[in-house]
């Protein structure tokens, strides 16, 4: 099943997020991703945990997963590089870089997103955008078109409370509020964008969604700038 969903959001404006990627397994949407360079998509490491024997591809330039669109193109993956410290049983270091088989054809609907390199927390309360093709309600309805939601960043101390994530949120992670509007497992690997800059990647650990006491968890890309640069080099 797809990993993740946007809850309480709405359909995104078509192709207004040209960095948005669908990481696909055997032709079906699996996870979100974000184009960070012409030939590289950033996603979540856990997305490929169960993909050992399947064919992993990346869809760029899409709004609808099923309908033909001039900008849509499916790319094979030349190389998948999970963060070396990512592990199946933790949310830490949940990043994955996918090298496309060739450089993406750039245009209005396909464009890399600048990512945050300054290792400083986003201010609590900042509204950030998260998008994905995950299911849109608790009944499991999967959208065909890209969904998005605006979420306020939550301070780490609140996120670390026992009734929230009980100390699991390290300096390399950030949280966003989850009161009915939320990202979830299936949106894993997708971008959290604040002020037009990629700040976080949706983690793919299992988590109840849409419950305000269980905020969404995002990997802070700035904390992994050295690793990202070393892989892209």
């Amino acid at each position: 099943p797809p990993r993740g969903r946007i809850l309480g959001g709405r359909e995104a404006e078509a192709h207004a997020r040209p960095y948005m990627a669908s990481v696909q397994l055997n032709g079906a949407h699996l996870c979100g991703g974000v184009l960070v360079a012409e030939q590289w998509v950033l996603s979540a490491a856990h997305c490929l945990e169960d993909a050992a024997d399947g064919k992993v591809q990346v869809l760029l330039g899409a709004h609808s997963l099923s309908q033909p669109e001039p900008s849509k193109r499916l790319y094979d993956v030349l190389r998948a590089v999970p963060h070396p410290d990512s592990q199946p049983d933790t949310i830490d270091h949940d990043l994955l870089l996918l090298q496309l088989s060739e450089k993406a054809t750039l245009g209005p609907a396909v464009r890399p997103l600048p990512w945050q390199r300054v290792d400083r927390d986003v201010a609590p309360g900042t509204l950030c955008d998260v998008a994905g093709w995950g299911i849109v309600n608790h009944a499991g309805r999967r959208p065909d078109s890209l969904q998005h939601v605006l979420l306020p960043v939550l301070d780490r101390a609140t996120c670390n409370r026992r009734t929230h994530h009980d100390g699991a949120i390290t300096e390399r992670l950030m949280c966003a509020e989850s009161n009915r509007r939320d990202s979830c497992k299936g949106d894993s690997g997708g971008p959290l964008v604040c002020g037009g800059v990629l700040e976080g990647v949706v983690t793919s650990g299992s988590r109840v969604c849409g419950n305000r006491k269980k905020p969404g968890i995002y990997t802070r890309v700035a904390s992994y700038a050295a690793w990202i640069d070393s892989v892209l080099a």
Partner: antibody
Framework: EVHLQQSGPELVKPGASVKISCKAS????????KNWMRQRHGESLEWIGD????????NYNQKFKGKATLTVDKSSSTAYMELRSLTSEDSAVYYC?????????WGQGTLVTVSA | DVLMTQTPLSLPVSLGDQASISCRSS???????????LEWYLQKPGQSPNLLIY???NRFSGVPDRFSGSGSGTDFTLKISRVEAEDLGVYYC?????????FGGGTKLEIK
């Protein structure tokens, strides 16, 4: 290594106030709530309240409202608790504890003795 | 406030014996998020409390596997399979699901 260092013992007169401190080290101070507990001699623990070091937001046990005031100084990574209008009933050991995970990290305790 | 009642008050044991401490809450301590925030702490003489168990049955890192927690709803138990000398002290249950959080009255584990 996470460490919470509390201020030393206090001997105070009835009606006076006292401010005790809890200095955090070994982690980012603003990433975790600070909680305060009271333990009278030979008794169990009582939760006084907690504070978010990011914005100074507090929650108090109704029992301690008007008695305890929690504050933080981010620049020195220190949490404070002021106790006012002290009586002999307030004589106890006071603990600070970091919340997350649970109360895994505690200060060593500050003994406050209220005596004329 | 949620009242946490521990029994027994005092528990004399011989080293190597099993010990069992009960904790009962005056109302269910299942949080609105579905989790149960029931914890166990050990306070040795002259020391601060130490976290042993969180969320009913999860051992905190470094806690020996002779300690185990169980229960649900309003009834909870801490078991020590083979008591060692370093286990002596006062054990407290704690609920963090409702405000204000509350501790049990304590159970003193001592040598018989």
């Amino acid at each position: 290594e996470v460490h919470l260092q509390q201020s030393g013992p206090e001997l105070v007169k009835p009606g006076a106030s006292v401010k005790i401190s809890c200095k955090a080290s070994g982690y980012t101070f603003t990433d975790f709530y600070k909680n305060w507990m009271r333990q009278r001699h030979g008794e169990s623990l009582e939760w006084i309240g907690d504070i978010n070091p990011n914005n100074g937001g507090t929650n108090y046990n109704q029992k301690f409202k008007g008695k305890a005031t929690l504050t933080v100084d981010k620049s020195s990574s220190t949490a404070y608790m002021e106790l006012r209008s002290l009586t002999s009933e307030d004589s106890a050991v006071y603990y600070c504890a970091r919340e997350g995970p649970s109360f895994a990290y505690w200060g060593q305790g500050t003994l406050v003795t209220v005596s004329a | 406030d949620v009242l946490m009642t521990q029994t027994p008050l005092s528990l004399p044991v011989s080293l190597g014996d099993q010990a069992s401490i009960s904790c009962r809450s005056s109302q269910t301590i299942v949080h609105s998020n579905g989790d149960t925030y029931l914890e166990w702490y050990l306070q040795k003489p002259g020391q601060s409390p130490n976290l042993l168990i969180y969320k009913v049955s999860n051992r905190f890192s470094g806690v020996p596997d002779r300690f185990s927690g169980s229960g649900s709803g309003t009834d909870f138990t801490l078991k020590i399979s083979r008591v060692e000398a370093e286990d002596l002290g006062v054990y407290y249950c704690f609920q963090g699901s409702h405000v204000p959080p509350t501790f049990g009255g304590g159970t003193k584990l001592e040598i018989k």
